[in-house]
Interface confidence: medium
Amino acid sequence: ELCDDDPPEIPHATFKAMAYKEGTMLNCECKRGFRRIKSGSLYMLCTGNSSHSSWDNQCQCTSSATRNTTKQVTPQPEEQKERKTTEMQSPMQPVDQASLPGHCREPPPWENEATERIYHFVVGQMVYYQCVQGYRALHRGPAESVCKMTHGKTRWTQPQLICTGEMETSQFPGEEKPQASPEGRPESETSCLVTTTDFQIQTEMAATMETSIFTTEYQ
């Protein structure tokens, strides 16, 4: 079942999926001046069996000027740099995301693809948020949103995240910057902080995405 809407937007934050559930579609979009080849796929589809998932179909773009030329898809490193996707640059990609049952990894780029990727997510998909550069999170822990089905309708849970500009902080003379107390910040949780410079989603998180160890809504 496809999710009706996109994941919620959070001010000064972006989101990414660590892996894509089977049934997810990715539009075959081409950058300006290029178009899909005739008889080319409209989208890529994450499909699979019990042991392996992969993307069906290939996206292929050709110059709008040339009608009959077809270019074979070969991932270009420079294209990767140019792409603006929904994903964030994270210092540590979960190494086992591809082995998560029923999920596909991020598809490789195709030649002349559009600068932004448009995904169509399915129920059960989870995405993770982080503040953009220059902003910091006021909550601890991974901010995530899950597409859920309730009463026959799909909805994304609201991620717990506030991103505020560092210039907005008000510290006054004599007002010390408090240290987090040991009770307030257990050692085991420090690597899960969502900050502007640190989005370290641990590999074990990817393995537990289906039954997330973190609650999206705290009630």
């Epitope: 006021l138 909550h139 601890r140 506030i162 505020t164 902080t169 987090a180 910040r185 009630q219």
Partner: antibody
Framework: QVQLVESGGGVVQPGRSLRLSCAAS????????MAWVRQAPGKGLEWVAV????????YYADSVKGRFTISRDNSKNTLYLQMNSLRAEDTAVYYC?????????WGQGTLVTVSS | DIQMTQSPSSLSASVGDRVTITCRAS??????LNWYQQKPGEAPRRLIY???SLQSGVPSRFSGSGSGTDYTLTISSLQPEDFATYYC?????????FGQGTKLEIK
């Protein structure tokens, strides 16, 4: 069940100080940003201050900057608002709220009256 | 600071009526807008977040729309329990700000 209970309100003279407390339960307090919102009698709502989960980042409305200090004690699941140099215009019901994107859960508020 | 202006300031309507309250921001708030309901002596209750997402447990007669600087809260068929004061609130940048409120009264 999330519960936020404010206390510490009362009548105080202009220029004096008061400290409000908010006892939180029903969620992992130390993971969440918290905020104070106030409402003058018969008037609208105003965000006063917000604090990050660990107390390291604080944000204030211009109207209280330099006079009010927001703080928290995660070991006691308690949020505080220290109000100094109080003015008549600070008279309001002060609400404690979970501060993420929304003001999702609120306490019932505590009334602060600044009057000579 | 971003100023939020609601209209009308007060409104009289009858049970069953369709009611619309508007909220205008002094600059774009990029759909980062909440709507709250407040009854006398009670804390505010969030109805809608992100312009049009209904808070869990809120009746479907409430809906929100808008973009940029202009936003709307619609109650499709007023119920007796809907008579209250409604506030919009932006959360795109600190300080987050509320509209001055719209008091919805029984005609």
């Amino acid at each position: 069940q999330v519960q936020l209970v404010e206390s510490g309100g009362g009548v105080v003279q202009p220029g004096r100080s008061l400290r409000l407390s908010c006892a939180a339960s029903g969620f992992t307090f130390s993971n969440h940003a918290m905020a104070w919102v106030r409402q003058a009698p018969g008037k609208g709502l105003e965000w006063v201050a917000v604090i990050s989960y660990d107390g390291s980042n604080k944000y204030y409305a211009d109207s209280v900057k330099g006079r009010f200090t927001i703080s928290r004690d995660n070991s006691k699941n308690t949020l505080y608002l220290q109000m100094n140099s109080l003015r008549a215009e600070d008279t309001a019901v002060y609400y404690c709220t979970t501060g993420w994107n929304s003001g999702y859960d609120w306490g019932q508020g505590t009334l602060v009256t600044v009057s000579s | 600071d971003i100023q939020m202006t609601q209209s009308p300031s007060s409104l009289s309507a009858s049970v069953g009526d369709r009611v619309t309250i508007t909220c205008r921001a002094s600059q774009s708030v990029s759909s980062f807008l909440n709507w709250y309901q407040q009854k006398p002596g009670e804390a505010p209750r969030r109805l809608i977040y992100g312009t049009n997402s209904l808070q869990s447990g809120v009746p479907s007669r409430f809906s929100g729309s808008g973009s940029g600087t202009d936003y709307t809260l619609t109650i499709s068929s007023l119920q007796p329990e809907d008579f209250a004061t409604y506030y919009c609130q932006q959360y795109t940048s600190w300080p987050w700000t509320f509209g001055q409120g719209t008091k919805l009264e029984i005609k």
